[in-house]
Interface confidence: medium
């Protein structure tokens, strides 16, 4: 843990500490912005993004956005601060270690989004119903 002689800063944007005094370095995420994707009708997909980026700020988490319309399918991979909405949606699953896609209402397209807080967790995006967090057994796995 952080030794007692280390002064903790409340206002410093560069460092975040948890309740146990562990310092959170910025997270590693896949970060290819928007790319065309072949991911369709699968339980899970790999991002096929070759760029692993270190997020700008320690509080940022990994995000993936899957969109399908009449013309194409895209997958967006980024870092984002969960305190701020992304595509007008709150990142409600930001503490999850896995990127479990949830459908969001967007006119004219099918829109799924997930967020997660382990390194490169947006590389593997999960659509499968068996990962739905209404399942109490899964909640045990996620929060253990």
């Amino acid at each position: 843990t952080i030794p007692p002689h280390v002064q903790k800063s409340v206002n410093n944007d560069m460092i975040v500490t948890d309740n146990n005094g562990a310092v959170k370095f910025p997270q590693l995420c896949k970060f290819c912005d928007v790319r065309f994707s072949t991911c369709d009708n699968q339980k899970s997909c790999m991002s096929n993004c070759s760029i692993t980026s270190i997020c700008e700020k320690p509080q940022e988490v990994c995000v993936a956005v899957w969109r399908k319309n009449d013309e194409n399918i895209t997958l967006e991979t980024v870092c984002h601060d969960p305190k701020l909405p992304y595509h007008d949606f709150i990142l409600e699953d930001a503490a999850s270690p896995k990127c479990i896609m949830k459908e969001k209402k967007k006119p004219g397209e099918t829109f799924f989004m997930c967020s997660c807080s382990s390194d490169e967790c947006n590389d593997n995006i999960i659509f499968s119903e068996e990962y739905n967090t209404s399942n109490p057994d899964l909640l045990l796995v996620i929060f253990q």
Epitope: T1, D18, N20, G21, A22, V23, K24, F25, P26, Q27, L28, T52, P58, P97, S117, S118, D119, E120, C121
Partner: nanobody, 120 residues
């Protein structure tokens, strides 16, 4: 018991170089991501750099990118920070830290730090 012992700090002129070392014990070093953080006088903590267990992926804060190089020698259980083109604003106590668990960005064990002073 986890122990991290930093060394190599000192007084250096602007533009100069230093190499910090961190000797690690009490955990499986070769399976653990490591990092450096620093604290300037009267300021908060700032992350500096992190390195994956095998040493093949390194990451840097924008403030040190292109000037600092993190590396490790798993056979010696030692982490390094090569600091070049040092500036007055690099003056700080430098701490090495170990990752709490693989895949997470939390670093939980620290050394006592080594002071780097950049001044003419």
């Amino acid at each position: 018991e986890v122990q991290l012992l930093e060394s190599g700090g000192g007084l250096v002129q602007p533009g100069g170089s230093l190499r910090l070392s961190c000797a690690a014990s009490g955990f499986t070093f070769e399976n653990t991501s490591m990092g450096w953080v620093r604290q300037a006088p009267g300021k908060g903590l700032e992350w500096v750099s992190r390195i994956d267990p095998k040493g093949s992926h390194t990451y840097y804060a924008d403030s040190v990118k292109g000037r600092f190089t993190i590396s490790r020698d798993n056979s010696k259980n030692t982490l390094y920070l090569q600091m070049n083109s040092l500036r007055a604003e690099d003056t700080a106590v430098y701490y090495c830290a170990k990752q709490r668990e693989l895949g997470k960005s939390h670093f939980d064990y620290w050394g006592q730090g080594t002071l780097v002073t950049v001044s003419s």
